[in-house]
């Protein structure tokens, strides 16, 4: 058993049929010695008396808010949560496996630039009685500071018969140099509590590996005389690291109709303009990627050909 | 120790070209190592990230763009000094700071070159003959060093008397390649910045 926060404790349980469970001793936070009784949650049934209460925790029915009283007055609370371990593996029931970039990916993180700011998000089908707490650091043995905000519900989607909820959090490394060469990864730890179930999820990454620039901005077209060709120009996104001559991007320019299976024109360039063939009912799209370290491409920025 | 915004300098072009070749060569070599050594811990997640130039050179700091010198977090460890002149500089106007930056890059390359050559000598003794260093990568390191053209003491190639542990050598190769790729990215950024300045 360990303390998650004040008066909230996590009991780690091997979860299998007829498991013996864990013996837990609760101590009432009071100078009083006599006349103390214990109850669980809203029940008035007295579980025991005395300054300490010893319980055998085996299942969720044994978890919850234990309260010690004296003469009708509440002295203190202890909330017990369960963390299940099945076949040596901690449970991951609360969050959905996003399976990208690989299986057992529960947390996904992205950074728009090298400033040390990044966003992580996760998915769940649970809509109520759910809380998250996020901590982060650079390295684990001698951790350097990373400050994370509160996790918030950022999107709701309908997937088949059930709803899916996306939560996200923004974090900022306390002293980040955009030009630095990372040797220690960022560690992100998410504590998830659903009702009386506790789970924790972690992710470890280098900022350089989670870079995904914003789409290029200010796409403009200029038809070329006596030609099917169009000159398309754009600018670096405002959120990209500066100076741009140091933090350079490379671009992919594509002309395509509405369907992905339609024919297309595609060209790659390090410049902020390119010449392509425009077709009726097609769109010109441009996306960006770090020129020197191939992490993710940005989303497309698009303008219609006509 | 930052790079001042200088006048466009035609002498930078060869270094930019060589640095692009360097990044390409080390990235290809790393990809080859990952594929060939698929049963070894050779991915970014599996290896320890070591920097053989740590406390010996200060390339990131010495080559910091002017715009980032206002960032306190970028200015924490800048004590190394190298004073020489290199042919990538071409113009006499080139500042002491830029010379410092380029000579730091030169020292990096020299250190990695020695490590890679020592390692290759060991890998050539491996009866499995599983992986060797790409001669193209070694040649590209050499070309960039020549383009930088700094005069520097020759570092003797390390020779080892004990029987090489090939498993350890291959893991060390992965660690070196990952670190060198990161440094090659920095070098490419620096050359691009200098070229545009």
């Amino acid at each position: 058993i360990w303390e998650l926060k004040k008066d909230v404790y996590v009991v780690e349980l091997d979860w299998y049929p007829d498991a013996p469970g864990e013996m837990v001793v609760l101590t009432c936070d009071t100078p009083e010695e006599d006349g103390i009784t214990w109850t669980l949650d809203q029940s008035s049934e007295v579980l025991g008396s005395g300054k300490t209460l010893t319980i055998q925790v085996k299942e969720f029915g044994d978890a919850g808010q234990y309260t010690c009283h004296k003469g009708g007055e509440v002295l203190s609370h202890s909330l017990l949560l369960l963390h299940k371990k099945e076949d040596g593996i901690w449970s991951t029931d609360i969050l959905k496996d996003q399976k990208e970039p690989k299986n057992k990916t529960f947390l996904r993180c992205e950074a728009k630039n090298y400033s040390g700011r990044f966003t992580c998000w996760w998915l769940t089908t649970i809509s109520t009685d759910l809380t998250f707490s996020v901590k982060s650091s650079r390295g684990s043995s001698d951790p350097q500071g990373v400050t994370c905000g509160a996790a918030t519900l950022s999107a709701e989607r309908v997937r088949g018969d059930n709803k899916e909820y996306e939560y996200s959090v923004e974090c900022q490394e306390d002293s980040a140099c955009p030009a630095a060469e990372e040797s220690l990864p960022i560690e992100v730890m998410v504590d998830a509590v659903h009702k009386l179930k506790y789970e924790n999820y972690t992710s470890s990454f280098f900022i350089r590996d989670i870079i995904k620039p914003d789409p290029p901005k200010n796409l403009q077209l200029k038809p070329l005389k006596n030609s099917r060709q169009v000159e398309v120009s754009w600018e670096y996104p405002d959120t990209w690291s500066t100076p741009h001559s140091y933090f350079s991007l490379t671009f992919c320019v594509q002309v395509q109709g509405k369907s992905k299976r339609e024919k297309k024109d595609r060209v790659f360039t390090d410049k902020t303009s390119a010449t392509v063939i425009c077709r009726k009912n097609a769109s010109i799209s441009v996306r960006a990627q770090d020129r020197y370290y191939s992490s993710s491409w940005s989303e497309w920025a698009s303008v219609p050909c006509s | 120790r930052n790079l001042p915004v200088a006048t466009p300098d035609p002498g930078m072009f060869p270094c930019l070209h060589h640095s692009q070749n360097l990044l390409r060569a080390v990235s290809n070599m790393l990809q080859k190592a990952r594929q060939t050594l698929e049963f070894y811990p050779c991915t970014s997640e599996e290896i320890d990230h070591e920097d053989i130039t740590k406390d010996k050179t200060s390339t990131v700091e010495a080559c910091l763009p002017l715009e980032l010198t206002k960032n306190e977090s970028c200015l924490n460890s800048r004590e190394t000094s190298f004073i020489t002149n290199g042919s990538c500089l071409a113009s006499r106007k080139t500042s002491f700071m830029m010379a410092l930056c380029l000579s730091s890059i030169y020292e990096d390359l020299k250190m990695y070159q020695v490590e890679f050559k020592t390692m290759n000598a060991k890998l050539l003794m491996d009866p499995k003959r599983q992986i060797f260093l790409d001669q193209n990568m070694l040649a590209v390191i050499d070309e960039l060093m020549q383009a930088l053209n700094f005069n520097s003491e020759t570092v003797p190639q390390k020779s080892s008397l004990e029987e090489p542990d090939f498993y350890k050598t291959k893991i060390k190769l992965c660690i070196l390649l990952h670190a060198f790729r990161i440094r090659a990215v920095t070098i490419d950024r620096v050359m691009s910045y200098l070229n545009a300045s």
Epitope: K263, D265, V267, T275, R279 | -
Partner: antibody
Framework: QVQLVQSGAEVKKPGSSVKVSCKAS????????LHWVRQAPGQGLEWMGW????????EYAPKFQGRVTITADESTSTAYMELSSLRSEDTAVYMC???????????WGQGTLVTVSS | DIVMTQSPLSLPVTPGEPASISCRAS??????LHWYQQKPGQAPRLLIY???QSISGVPSRFSGSGSGTDFTLTISSLQPEDFATYYC?????????FGQGTKVEIK
């Protein structure tokens, strides 16, 4: 199975014109760009131009501008390349090639040898 | 027009040995570079597109690398069926242009 089948060899006099055909099978004809590339005996490849069969848009290499015409007939899934004012240096194998991507070629025809000789 | 220069023009190789063909562009073309194989009396066959992207059905011994002006086609271990002429082609701008070809011959 996408295939491009070209018309047979031709012998032409200098100053005349030649029209080579390229019939496509497998896949929808208008879903692909169609190009013409030529190869003189023992020489390399030379791009001549392309057509979008969907709308008839064409683009030609400056070297052939004014002398080459590329057309397409959607009803027969056939593209044509006509080269006029032939000279001896136009002796080559003319190949059609196609792709959903405009700028490179993933399926090629077998080639048509055009000999220009007086 | 962008001029593509291949080297060497002729490459004698022992079967089972690796081979590398270089292609240089007269100006930077990013990764807009494609490789083809052509055997006598046959049409070319696409091997690699956009400098390094492999084509399904093409053996994994063929790989491409490069960006900007310098590109390489590598055959890791030459098989008897690989003896042919190889062409690079740029798609950075029209007109599309090819290298002059590299003939890989049996040593």
């Amino acid at each position: 199975q996408v295939q491009l089948v070209q018309s047979g060899a031709e012998v032409k006099k200098p100053g005349s014109s030649v029209k080579v055909s390229c019939k496509a099978s497998g896949g929808t004809f208008s879903d692909y760009y169609l190009h013409w590339v030529r190869q003189a005996p023992g020489q390399g490849l030379e791009w001549m131009g392309w057509i979008d069969p969907e709308n008839g848009d064409t683009e030609y290499a400056p070297k052939f501008q004014g002398r080459v015409t590329i057309t397409a007939d959607e009803s027969t899934s056939t593209a044509y390349m006509e080269l006029s004012s032939l000279r001896s240096e136009d002796t080559a194998v003319y190949m059609c090639a196609r792709n959903k991507e405009l700028r490179y070629f993933d399926v090629w025809g077998q080639g048509t040898l055009v000999t220009v000789s007086s | 027009d962008i001029v593509m220069t291949q080297s060497p023009l002729s490459l004698p190789v022992t079967p089972g040995e690796p081979a590398s063909i270089s292609c240089r562009a007269s100006q930077s073309i990013s990764i807009n570079l494609h490789w083809y194989q052509q055997k006598p009396g046959q049409a070319p066959r696409l091997l690699i597109y956009f400098a390094s992207q492999s084509i399904s059905g093409v053996p994994s011994r063929f790989s491409g690398s490069g960006s900007g002006t310098d590109f390489t086609l590598t055959i890791s271990s030459l098989q008897p069926e690989d003896f042919a002429t190889y062409y690079c082609q740029q798609s950075n701008s029209f007109p599309l242009t090819f290298g002059q070809g590299t003939k890989v011959e049996i040593k």
